[in-house]
């Protein structure tokens, strides 16, 4: 997914785990696959800057070459810069790796805006702050790109964690996580805790800040509070889920639930914003405007373009409503809801106004490719990608930004009938019509 808002981040910031830790509730969920409990070596292994994505340090080749790699659950290729580029401090030098193998095949990935292309090969890959294993994985060596790398983002490649169906050039190219699980005893599960800053960071702070955790092979209890609620993965391509209801400050948008998933709903760490289908976006903005009507904001703010600024420390969080998405549960006719605060959907932007001001962008935007639950959503929650059991779990993140009056929430169960009808069935065509763009 390309941030930006498919980033490459398509619009999340890395900050130190902030906010109050909430008291833990007893775990009620059934037994999880994978090691449980403490993955101390993987905690805080992500960094990033607002709107530019979360990245993990990886090594490729022999001897190992260290690169920062964007963590992207909205795509399925492991692709790294492999040629000089003005925005890259370093890149993968295949000629220096004794274990590189050329697959003699090219790959071309166009986005709605921009593209990258490269040459396919395999090499040895490891994650220093991850499991203590080395695997041979497919690597797309990016030789040419346009509007893909981001100046100052500090990452040099992308780790697509979704399924083979959306890999380029086709689904025969095994994604990294599949290779990892096949070649090791690591359970087929990973989890992400993305920690937004909640306030603008200057460049020094942003570069030094911790951005969150990618736990490979299981779940770390220290990263969430309360219990995990799971929604089925509808289809293994993107991490597709089904939204059955949307509320703004508890007020139902009252739309046909198919609209919420038109033409799909996905969980995408490589997109900055919460992106909503056109009709849903318009209804949601109308409702958010009504809820915050004691103040009026410029048209460009609701388009995600203009910034609104308040004197430092005076942002009126209370006038903005919470947004709740109800997700299909694991039990028939049962759903649960995830609720985010304005602290998640108003994204702090640094270096714009004076140091006396806090400035924000509205990080809910319109989509023509379905709902995208990007960093804006994920920064509120600990998100478990339980591939083994074809489900995604949500719990309140121990690092989400909140205030003394409201916190993000994951609550259930709720009785919801006919949830299967909420899924949209994309008409099948003979040709692939996959659009990679995630702006």
């Amino acid at each position: 997914t390309h941030l930006g808002i498919r980033l490459p981040l398509r619009s999340g910031l890395a900050g130190p785990p902030l906010g109050l830790r909430l008291p833990r509730e007893t775990d009620e969920e059934s037994e999880e696959p994978g090691r449980r409990g403490s993955f101390v070596e993987m905690v805080d292994n992500l960094r990033g800057k607002s709107g530019q994505g979360y990245y993990v340090e990886m090594t490729v080749g022999s001897p190992p070459q260290t690169l920062n790699i964007l963590v992207d659950t909205g795509s399925s290729n492991f692709a790294v810069g492999a040629a000089p580029h003005p925005f890259l401090h370093r890149y993968y030098q295949r000629q220096l790796s004794s274990t590189y193998r050329d697959l003699r095949k090219g790959v071309y990935v166009p986005y709605t805006q921009g593209k990258w292309e490269g040459e396919l090969g395999t090499d040895l890959v490891s994650i220093p702050h991850g499991p203590n294993v080395t695997v041979r994985a497919n690597i797309a060596a990016i030789t040419e790109s346009d509007k893909f790398f981001i100046n100052g983002s500090n990452w040099e490649g992308i780790l697509g964690l979704a399924y083979a169906e959306i890999a380029r050039p086709d689904d025969s190219l095994e994604p990294f996580f599949d290779s990892l699980v096949k070649q090791t005893h690591i359970p087929n599960i990973f989890s992400l805790q993305l920690c937004g800053a909640g306030f603008p960071l200057n460049q020094t702070e942003a570069l030094a800040s911790v951005g969150g955790s990618m736990i490979i092979g299981g779940i770390d209890h220290s990263l969430y509070t309360g219990r995990l609620w799971y929604t089925p993965i509808r289809r293994e391509w993107y991490y597709e889920v089904i939204i059955v209801r949307v509320e703004i400050n508890g007020q139902d948008l009252k739309m046909d639930c198919k609209e919420y998933n038109y033409d799909k709903s996905i969980v995408d760490s490589g997109t900055t914003n919460l992106r909503l289908p056109k009709k849903v976006f318009e209804a949601a903005v109308k409702s958010i405007k009504a809820a915050s009507s004691t103040e009026k904001f410029p048209d460009g703010f609701w388009l995600g373009e203009q910034l609104v600024c308040w004197q430092a420390g005076t942002t009126p969080w209370n006038i903005f409503p919470v947004i709740s998405l109800y997700l299909m549960g694991e039990v028939t006719n049962q759903s649960f809801r995830i609720t985010i605060l304005p602290q998640q959907y108003l994204r702090p932007v640094e270096d714009v106004a004076t140091s006396q001001d806090d400035c924000y962008k509205f990080a809910v935007s319109q989509s023509s490719t379905g709902t995208v639950m990007g960093a804006v959503i994920m920064e509120g929650f600990y998100v478990v990608f339980d591939r083994a059991r074809k489900r995604i779990g949500f719990a309140v993140s121990a690092c989400h930004v909140h205030d003394e009056f409201r916190t993000a929430a994951v609550e259930g169960p709720f009785v919801t009938a006919d949830m299967e009808d909420c899924g949209y069935n994309i008409p099948q065509t003979d040709e692939s019509t996959l659009m990679t763009g995630r702006a």
Epitope: E295, G300, A353
Partner: antibody
Framework: QLQLQESGPGLVKPSETLSLTCTVS??????????WGWIRQPPGKGLEWIGS???????YYNPSLKSRVTISVDTSKNQFSLKLSSVTAADTAVYYC????????????WGRGTLVTVSS | EIVLTQSPATLSLSPGERATLSCRAS??????LAWYQQKPGQAPRLLIY???KRATGIPARFSGSGSGTDFTLTISSLEPEDFAVYYC??????????FGGGTKVEIK
Amino acid sequence: QLQLQESGPGLVKPSETLSLTCTVSGGSISSSSYYWGWIRQPPGKGLEWIGSIYYSGSTYYNPSLKSRVTISVDTSKNQFSLKLSSVTAADTAVYYCARVGHGISYFDLWGRGTLVTVSS
Amino acid sequence: EIVLTQSPATLSLSPGERATLSCRASQSVSSYLAWYQQKPGQAPRLLIYDASKRATGIPARFSGSGSGTDFTLTISSLEPEDFAVYYCQQVYTWPPRTFGGGTKVEIK
């Protein structure tokens, strides 16, 4: 058509409070489509935004003046007002009231302005 | 803070000539920029908003262009009433607060 007219004393003593009122005629100040603002211009100098207000009473102030500024609205009289406390000679300026339109972003309609001199 | 720098400070031209005024932002303001005209003893008047849209009643000889950090106000053929001071203003950050220092267009 809508018009704005500033009124208030043209001379204020140092350390006192400058008070101005802007009367909106030909339209309602309670329109949800606009903010209302104050801008000033010292003699021979450029424009400085002072602050803006919505009919609900929600205000925004220039950080450099915030500690001294109060802007209020009286929808029954179709007026909004400016108070600037502890004035000095540096506050001598032409004070304009204006409507913030075009997507609540630009000053699309201005009053004629009133010169306020701070002097003992 | 976003700073707007206008150049030149003064532009000396004759009626009928083309005037090109520049406004440069210290960082991108997208297309959220306006131009105002102020004649002596009068209030400013909105000429251009959103970088290139003419406000109501503004003659076609006034045009705006640019996006990001560099913007231009062009007066295709100066009329006697166009000699005035011109200000740019950014509203990328809201509320609208930042004006440029102004460019005076005077008769040569």
